[in-house]
C-alpha cells in the first residue's frame, strides 16, 4: 500500500466577512481527510498581512487583526494539511477571504453640480434632477437613499422629491426669486446599518439669460440650463 497525502474537500475555500469583524471571530474553515485515516494538522502559508490563524486540529480560521478591504479583496492564503505521523505527507489548498464593506461612507452628490441655473425671472416653477452616491459596496441591493431639505427655512422656497433610490428632484415652490445665487442644502440618508447621513449643497443661480444661457461678463463661461 502506497501512503497518500491528505485530500482537501475543495480546491478553494471561500468565505465572506464584514471588514469590521471583531478580532477573534471565526471567518471560515477548511476540511481535509487522510486516505489512511491518520490525523491531520492544518497550517496557513502566505498570510502576509498577518490577519489569520488556523486551529491546527479543526481547520477553523479566525481573524487575529483588524481587516481592511482597502488593502485588497479577495485576500488569498494557502492552507496546508499534513499527516500526523506516518510520512508526514501534505497537500495544499487555498482560502479566499472576501471582505465585505461596512456602511462607513456617508452619501454624497454623484457629480459636480456647480453651474445650475434658472433664467430670471421665472415664468413658472422650475425643477432639476440630481443624483446621490456613496463609496460603500451595496451587498444585496443597490443604494436606497432618502432625500430631504437640509434646513426648515428652505421649505418656503424649495421642495425635494425622491425619484428612485439614487435620484431626486429639486423644485422651486414659487417664481419670486431674486437674481442671485441660492445655496440649497439637501440631507441624504442611506438607510444603512448604522444609517449615515450627508448634507450636500446645490448652488442654484437665478440670472438674466441670453439665448438660453446665463449672461456673464466676458471671461466667464456659460452655465448649464435646467428647467
Amino acid at each position: 500500500d502506497v501512503n497518500e497525502a491528505p485530500q482537501f474537500s475543495q480546491h478553494v475555500f471561500q468565505a465572506k466577512v464584514s471588514e469590521d469583524v471583531a478580532i477573534g471571530t471565526k471567518v471560515g474553515n477548511v476540511t481535509a481527510k487522510d486516505p489512511e485515516g491518520l490525523d491531520i494538522s492544518y497550517s496557513l502559508r502566505g498570510d502576509t498581512r498577518g490577519w489569520l490563524k488556523i486551529d491546527h486540529v479543526t481547520g477553523e480560521i479566525f481573524s487575529v487583526a483588524p481587516l481592511d478591504r482597502e488593502a485588497g479583496s479577495p485576500y488569498r492564503v494557502q492552507v496546508v494539511a499534513t499527516e500526523v505521523g506516518g510520512s508526514s505527507l501534505s497537500s495544499v489548498s487555498e482560502f479566499h477571504l472576501i471582505l465585505m464593506d461596512v456602511n462607513d461612507n456617508p452619501p454624497r452628490l454623484a457629480k459636480d453640480y456647480t453651474g445650475l441655473f434658472f433664467c430670471h425671472p421665472l415664468s413658472a416653477p422650475g425643477s432639476l434632477i440630481f443624483e446621490a452616491t456613496d463609496d460603500d459596496q451595496h451587498l444585496f441591493r443597490g443604494p436606497h437613499f432618502t432625500f430631504s431639505l437640509g434646513s426648515g427655512s428652505l421649505q418656503n422656497d424649495w421642495e425635494v422629491s425622491k425619484i428612485n433610490g439614487t435620484h431626486a428632484r429639486l423644485s422651486t415652490r414659487h417664481t419670486e426669486f431674486e437674481e442671485r445665487e441660492y445655496v440649497v442644502l439637501i440631507r441624504i440618508n442611506d438607510g444603512g446599518r448604522p444609517p449615515l447621513e450627508g448634507i450636500v449643497s446645490l448652488p442654484v443661480t437665478f440670472c438674466s439669460c441670453v439665448e438660453g444661457s446665463c449672461f456673464r461678463p466676458a471671461g466667464h463661461k456659460h452655465h448649464h440650463h435646467h428647467h
Partner: antibody, heavy 119, light 113 residues
Amino acid sequence: QVQLVQSGAEVKKPGASVKVSCKASGYTFTDYWMNWVRQAPGQGLEWMGAIDPSDRYTNYAQKFQGRVTMTRDTSTSTVYMELSSLRSEDTAVYYCARGGYGDYWFANWGQGTLVTVSS
Amino acid sequence: DIVMTQSPDSLAVSLGERATINCKSSQNLLSSGTQKNYLAWYQQKPGQPPKPLIYFASTRESGVPDRFSGSGSGTDFTLTISSLQAEDVAVYYCQQHHYFPWTFGGGTKVEIK
C-alpha cells in the same frame, strides 16, 4: 459542456430600465461566480459587477452603483442584470461570464445581448 | 482600482511571424500568499464574445493552441503568438483578477501585414 444563454436584444428609451437574463447549464450553478461585462460599439470591455449565486452576494463596479442590480434564481439556474436610468451611452452589448475554476477570471461567456438606448 | 495598460494599440504581423502584446498593471498582481499572478488574456473576434486564452499569467485554457503563451510577473506581462495564423486576427485583452473590481486593458488589435 458549460453553456450560458442570454435573452434577446432590447431597445429602450432614455430613463427606462432593462433586465437581461443569462441561463446557465452544464455545471453546478451555485459553485461559480457570474459576472456581467459590457462593450459599447467599437470600444473595449468593461466589468460591471458579479454575483455569487450560492448566497446572492454582489459586488458592483463603483461606476454602476445605484443603477445596477444583479439577482439569481437557483430553481432555473438563471442570473439577471437590471440597469436603470438608461442613457444613450449605455448602448452596448452586455455579456454574462462565468468565473473560472478556483478563481475569478472569465472562463465561459454568454453570446451577448445588445441593448440600444435611443429616444 | 487597478489600471491595466496595453501596448501597442494595434500591430500588423506577417503570417508565420511572432506577435507580442504587452500589458502593464498599476499594482503588483503577484500574490505573496499563493505565489500566483492573477492576470488573464482574452481573444475577441468581430461579432463574438471574448474567448479566454490564458489565466494565472501563463496557464493556457484547455483547447488553446500552444502557439499562444503568456509570461511576466508582478506588473509587466506579455502575450506571445509564436507563429501568427490567419485565424488569430482579433482584438486581445488583458484582465486582472487579483482584486475587486476586475479591470481590463484597452485592447490590442492584431492584423496581418
